[in-house]
């Protein structure tokens, strides 16, 4: 913490300008009025403060706004945003997409994924839902950031907005997030024709249930291996060899390379070896001929 001293008369600050870069930390602490700083935040980013000096300015704002900064200050944080922790950001109420854009630009190239995720979360809360304008801003200024939102926040996305989401925006989404987004995408694209529907729904398929994957296998879609590998394990396990063959088309040849990786490995273990042999890839690990499969989970459920 910066020690409290009184400000020498000749160092008194009446406006935020470049002369402040020559102030020592304790002089900044003593001479800069927090209210003046807040009122002239738009000038701060144009001044080449050191990181140490920015620490002092942040300390000033923290004292003035212990409950969190107002958006008029947040919008003009500039490089001061790099000093913010997720805990600081959690106190904010942000509704303006201009504020979001400004801070996303500042964070680019810095390791700030936790701060950015918290900021986006605050924007969604502030705006009430993840609307089209917010999604457009995220896809333009922060590809992949959509996946930093919790499933709860993502549930506020209206299906009509799903069309604005690009495949690369979903690259880092986990299964729980895709579970939320997939039904919305299914609804959003339901009126499209088979091939066009598949192109659109493909990035969301990590959240698809078995019955939807089975339905796709009847539509000659030729699903690529990368998409297949992202399907939920629970969605893949009930598929038959014939269904996987129809689902993947020529891409089924790629199963050999994925033989040891989930969900392919787990799926192989549930297939009859005879059926696996029909794929012509030498896949091993299926249920040998003549073996009876008992599903004990059914018996447990009944007892």
């Amino acid at each position: 913490d910066v020690e409290r001293t009184t400000c020498p008369p000749e160092k008194e600050v009446h406006e935020i300008d470049e002369s402040l870069i020559f102030y020592k930390k304790r002089e900044l602490e003593a001479c800069v009025d927090a209210a003046l700083l807040a009122a002239q935040m738009d000038r701060v980013d144009a001044i080449p403060f050191t990181y140490e000096q920015l620490d002092v300015l942040k300390h000033k704002l923290d004292e003035l706004y212990p409950q969190g900064y107002p958006e008029s200050v947040i919008r003009h944080l500039g490089h001061l945003f790099l000093k913010m922790s997720p805990e600081d950001i959690r106190k904010w109420n942000v509704t303006s997409l201009e504020t979001l854009k400004a801070l996303l630009k500042v964070s680019k190239g810095h390791e700030m994924s936790a701060q950015v995720a918290t900021l986006i979360d605050r924007v969604v809360v502030g705006r009430g839902q993840l609307d089209k304008d917010t999604v457009d801003t995220l896809t333009a200024f922060c590809p992949g950031c959509l996946c930093s939102l919790s499933p709860e926040r993502l549930s506020s996305v209206p299906p009509s907005v799903i069309g604005a989401v690009r495949p690369q925006d979903l690259d880092t989404c986990g299964p729980r997030q895709l579970d939320v987004l997939y039904p919305k995408a299914r609804l959003a694209f339901q009126n499209m024709s088979g091939s066009e529907y598949f192109v659109k729904i493909r990035p969301f398929l990590g959240g698809a249930p078995t019955e939807d994957v089975k339905a796709l296998s009847q539509q000659n879609v030729s699903m690529d291996l990368a998409t297949f590998m992202k399907l939920r394990r629970e969605a893949v396990l009930p598929l038959t060899v014939a269904e996987v063959q129809k689902l993947l088309g020529p891409h089924v040849e790629g199963l050999k390379v994925e033989e040891q990786h989930s969900p392919v490995r787990d799926w192989i273990l549930k297939q009859r070896q005879d059926d696996l042999d029909t794929l012509g890839l030498g896949l091993q690990g299926g249920i040998p001929n003549g073996y009876l499969i008992l599903d004990l989970s059914v018996r447990e459920a009944l007892s």
């Epitope: 690529d224 790629g254 012509g280 890839l281 030498g282």
Partner: antibody, heavy 121, light 107 residues
Framework: EVQLVQSGAEVKKPGASVKVSCKAS????????MHWVRQAPGQGLEWMGN????????YYNERFRSRVTMTVDKSTSTVYMELSSLRSEDTAVYYC??????????????WGQGTTVTVSS | DIQMTQSPSSLSASVGDRVTITCKAS??????IAWYQHKPGKAPKLLIH???ELQPGVPSRFSGSGSGRDYTFTISSLQPEDIATYYC?????????FGGGTKVEIK
């Protein structure tokens, strides 16, 4: 030792069909799909399609789909590639090739010696 | 389908020269590219797979590099026995495609 032995050279008239064979040995025949690649004089290599040797299911390059038929005889570990409605541009060396599934969909590590097909009136 | 654009289509170099051939894919192929040497009357010979992995028995003067859509094949010191046509193959997609080929000649 893996070997892919192809049938001999053929001379065909335009409009006719040709059937080229490729007999595999030295590995488990039903564990690797077989591919066909051709090279016309002065042209590059062109992938024609492939076949699953276990169930006989083929996938063709769109360019040849209407004229090519790939089949398999498991009892003799032989695959066949038949090309119909031949034209002079089909004059080429036809190769069968076996992939190695080391990564992605596999690259070709074993090739047949090639079969020259000449289409001439 | 993925298109592979190979250049140059032919080149002439002296023994000992460094020779470079490029292949550009129409989309990202994640390093799934192989390089073949093809001599008249013979089957193509696999030299390199997965962008830079040299096949056993292939001389170390052959090398490969690249990522995304752009790939390069290099012969560090051209030898008389390297006279052939060289092809790239993408296998990132089950519907494989070759580059147009590069005919390498000795000056």
């Amino acid at each position: 030792e893996v070997q892919l032995v192809q049938s001999g050279a053929e001379v065909k008239k335009p409009g006719a069909s040709v059937k080229v064979s490729c007999k595999a040995s030295g590995y488990t025949f039903t564990n690797y799909w077989m591919h066909w690649v051709r090279q016309a004089p002065g042209q590059g290599l062109e992938w024609m399609g492939n076949i699953n040797p276990s169930n006989g299911g083929p996938y063709y390059n769109e360019r040849f789909r209407s004229r090519v038929t790939m089949t398999v005889d498991k009892s003799t570990s032989t695959v066949y590639m038949e090309l119909s409605s031949l034209r002079s541009e089909d004059t080429a060396v036809y190769y069968c090739a076996r992939p190695y599934y080391g990564s992605s969909y596999g690259y070709f590590d074993y090739w047949g010696q090639g079969t020259t097909v000449t289409v001439s009136s | 389908d993925i298109q592979m654009t190979q250049s140059p289509s032919s080149l002439s170099a002296s023994v000992g020269d460094r020779v470079t051939i490029t292949c550009k894919a129409s989309q990202d192929i994640n390093k799934y590219i192989a390089w073949y040497q093809h001599k008249p009357g013979k089957a193509p010979k696999l030299l390199i797979h997965y962008t830079s992995e040299l096949q056993p028995g292939v001389p170390s003067r052959f090398s490969g590099s690249g990522s995304g859509r752009d790939y390069t094949f290099t012969i560090s010191s051209l030898q008389p026995e390297d006279i052939a046509t060289y092809y790239c193959l993408q296998y990132a997609n089950p519907l494989r495609t070759f580059g147009g080929g590069t005919k390498v000649e000795i000056k």
